[in-house]
């Protein structure tokens, strides 16, 4: 059994609510800002996660070459809309009208706009790159072992399949990871990429999710390793519609 | 979903051993840790293991150790010199896989039933 369960927290997310109201006097949490009930069993979506965060008080919170059409969260924190699912709804408005549309992860993906703008669908996010800067250590990380202990970070941590876990790849300092998930691999109960995606580079900023204050100890043969920088490129199913203005910028 | 049960308990005079264990079904890679409530107290965290490295609290410094076995899924809390204020309900704990190990139960996701230990003198 679990501490949800007796001490009725929530042991994938701190950023809830939680009371013994459930069926049978279960524990049941739900999510800050929305006030959604979530599986504290597995991840939160990023999209209630990102809408927690907004409304909690400010003082708490071989290389690959990433394709011309990758996406950088460059425009950081906003309160997104969320639908019944926690997914991103696909349209995405501000508070003073202006709208665009975002990708499963929450990302921008044209420019921005009026109330007219219009959001098709929901683009899937398929393929995500994760770069990541080590800090310095006496020598270089053996690849199987990084590569090992990542796969398993991304399973047991994040409850992400393997079959996801696409790459690793090292070239001293550098790693990186690719998660790859179409929808069509996508099952029922199975972790979006997105959401591990997210949890991974809160864990590494010291900013853990997770109920438990220490935050994440992550070592390659009992050897720490400690990120100093971390770059995420998002791509799409569908290619992103930016104007060349924003591209030439 | 984790399930841990503690076996290895019983009654045993001052000054005696026991070998308590605590076998995890669906074992994850988790800081594994080992508290104790006697009657009427607070749940006391006794000692933890993670990645091969342990803690203990002062109070069974030098007398309990803790050591884990892979293989078999199982940690085991070898419990030496008891003395009767030992006497308590044992439980073993694992906190979510790849959380940095801590005494805070508050921090422990996954809890045994526990096993009952008395130390008469």
């Known amino acids: 059994h679990t501490a949800a369960q007796d001490n009725c927290t929530c042991p994938t997310n701190k950023m809830t609510v939680c009371s013994p109201d459930g069926p049978g006097g279960r524990c049941q949490c739900r999510a800050l800002g929305s006030g959604m009930a979530v599986d504290c069993s597995t991840l939160t979506s990023k999209c209630l996660l990102l809408k927690a965060r907004m409304s909690a008080p400010k003082n708490a919170r071989t290389l690959v070459r990433p394709s011309e059409h990758a996406l950088v969260d460059n425009d950081g924190l906003y309160d997104p809309d969320c639908d019944p699912e926690g997914r991103f709804k696909a349209r995405q408005c501000n508070q003073t009208s202006v709208c665009w549309c975002v990708n499963s992860v929450g990302v921008r993906r044209t420019d921005k706009g009026d109330l007219s703008l219009r959001c098709d669908e929901l683009v899937r996010t398929h393929h995500i790159l994760i770069d990541l800067r080590h800090r310095p250590t006496a020598g270089a990380f053996n690849h199987s072992d990084l590569d090992a202990e990542l796969r398993r970070l991304f399973r047991e941590r994040y409850r992400l399949h393997p079959k996801f876990v696409a790459a690793v790849h090292y070239e001293q300092p550098t790693i990186q990871i690719e998660l790859r998930q179409n929808t069509s691999q996508k099952a029922a109960g199975d972790v979006d990429i997105g959401d591990a995606a997210y949890y991974f580079e809160r864990d590494i900023k010291g900013e853990s999710l997770f109920q438990g204050r220490g935050g994440l100890d992550l070592r390659v043969r009992g050897e720490p390793l400690q990120v100093e920088r971390t770059l995420i490129y998002y791509l799409d199913e569908i290619p992103p519609k930016f104007s060349m203005k924003r591209l030439t910028a | 979903q984790v399930q841990l049960q503690e076996s290895g308990g019983g009654s045993v005079q001052a000054g005696g051993s026991l070998r308590l264990s605590c076998e995890a079904s669906?074992?994850?890679?988790?800081?594994m840790g080992w508290f104790r409530q006697a009657p009427g107290k607070e749940r006391e965290a006794i000692a933890n293991?993670?990645?091969?490295?342990?803690n203990y609290a002062d109070s069974v410094k030098g007398r309990f150790t803790v050591s884990q076995d892979n293989a078999r899924n199982t940690v085991y809390l070898q419990m030496n010199s008891l003395k009767p204020g030992d006497t308590a309900m044992y439980f073993c704990a694992a906190m979510w896989p790849y959380d940095r190990c801590g005494m805070d139960a508050r921090d422990y996701v996954y809890w045994g039933q526990g096993t009952q230990v008395t130390v008469s003198s």
């Open positions: 669906g074992y994850t890679y988790s800081c």
């Open positions: 293991i993670y990645g091969g490295r342990t």
